[in-house]
């Protein structure tokens, strides 16, 4: 009876389990009754990273020096080339597909710490009493104002992205 | 297309002063907090100023501070840098930058050299 399910680094057609070609590989045919999968080796600037049945490797990731990248770790046939930015300068994700001088903290958040040729800048969430309504890579977060100090009462609570709104005290008649 | 051209850099004696200008299109400058980063020789990107959009605040790396002022026209579209008793070690090429600034953004930047 034919198998409905194969062992790890096998996989099932025509009603046979067939090997996985090897990570750095690419099948070229499927196994027969008689013959056993045939794989090749991927080429230059190529990977495949997993046991699989791809009939095309992938191409490695291009470090485009226009968009500041370098590579950090050439690819390997069954790995992706890994990039990197220019000294002072910090990949916008962690695929590193481009890179920006220093990213900023969003509303909400405070600067901790300013960028460095080393280390992005650090960003902190603003605690109760402060606030940031704005993106930035400097701003750290601003205290509420303090309707108090002024004569005045809380209108509108604060929050970590706005101010508190204060107003005219109710005077009694 | 963002465009950044800087200029106003040259050779200036130590203790002098000079006033670094940035001409900024295609972006609403007015927006956008704004930055002044400089690299020496055979060092790494330093981040010199800030200013935030309105220009009511402001940054300054210690190495700069109560020397170096900061100020933007947002009517001209233009981004300055006041340097004043500039020192040896402020020699290096200026660059303005906008937040965020991607690295294929960034001007040609001007050269800054302080020597006798």
């Known amino acids: 009876e034919p198998p409905t399910a194969c062992r790890e680094k096998q996989y099932l057609i025509n009603s046979q389990c067939c090997s996985l070609c090897q990570p750095g590989q690419k099948l070229v045919s499927d196994c027969t009754e008689f013959t056993e999968t045939e794989c090749l080796p991927c080429g230059e600037s190529e990977f495949l990273d997993t046991w699989n049945r791809e009939t095309h490797c992938h191409q490695h990731k291009y470090c485009d020096p226009n968009l500041g990248l370098r590579v950090q770790q050439k690819g390997t046939s069954e790995t992706d080339t890994i990039c990197t930015c220019e000294e002072g300068w910090h990949c916008t994700s962690e695929a590193c597909e481009s890179c920006v001088l220093h990213r900023s903290c969003s509303p909400g958040f405070g600067v901790k710490q300013i960028a460095t040729g080393v280390s992005d800048t650090i960003c902190e969430p603003c605690p109760v009493g402060f606030f940031s309504n704005v993106s930035s890579a400097f701003e750290k977060c601003h205290p509420w104002t303090s309707c108090e100090t002024k004569d005045l009462v809380v209108q509108q609570a604060g929050t970590n992205k706005t101010d508190v709104v204060c107003g005219p005290q109710d005077r009694l008649r | 297309e963002v465009q950044l051209l800087e200029s106003g850099g040259g050779l200036v004696q130590p203790g002098g002063s000079l006033r670094l200008s940035c001409a900024a299109s295609g972006f609403t400058f007015r927006d956008y907090e704004m930055w002044w980063v400089r690299q020496a020789p055979g060092k790494g990107l330093e981040r010199v100023s800030a200013i935030n959009p309105q220009g009511t605040r402001t940054y300054y790396a210690d190495s700069v501070k109560g020397r170096f002022t900061i100020s933007r026209d947002n009517s001209k579209n233009t981004l300055y840098l006041q340097m004043n008793s500039l020192r040896a070690e402020d020699t290096a090429v200026y660059y303005c930058?906008?937040?965020?600034?991607?690295?294929?953004?960034r001007g040609q930047g001007t050269l800054v050299t302080v020597s006798s």
């Open positions: 930058a906008k937040l965020p600034t991607y690295f294929s953004d």
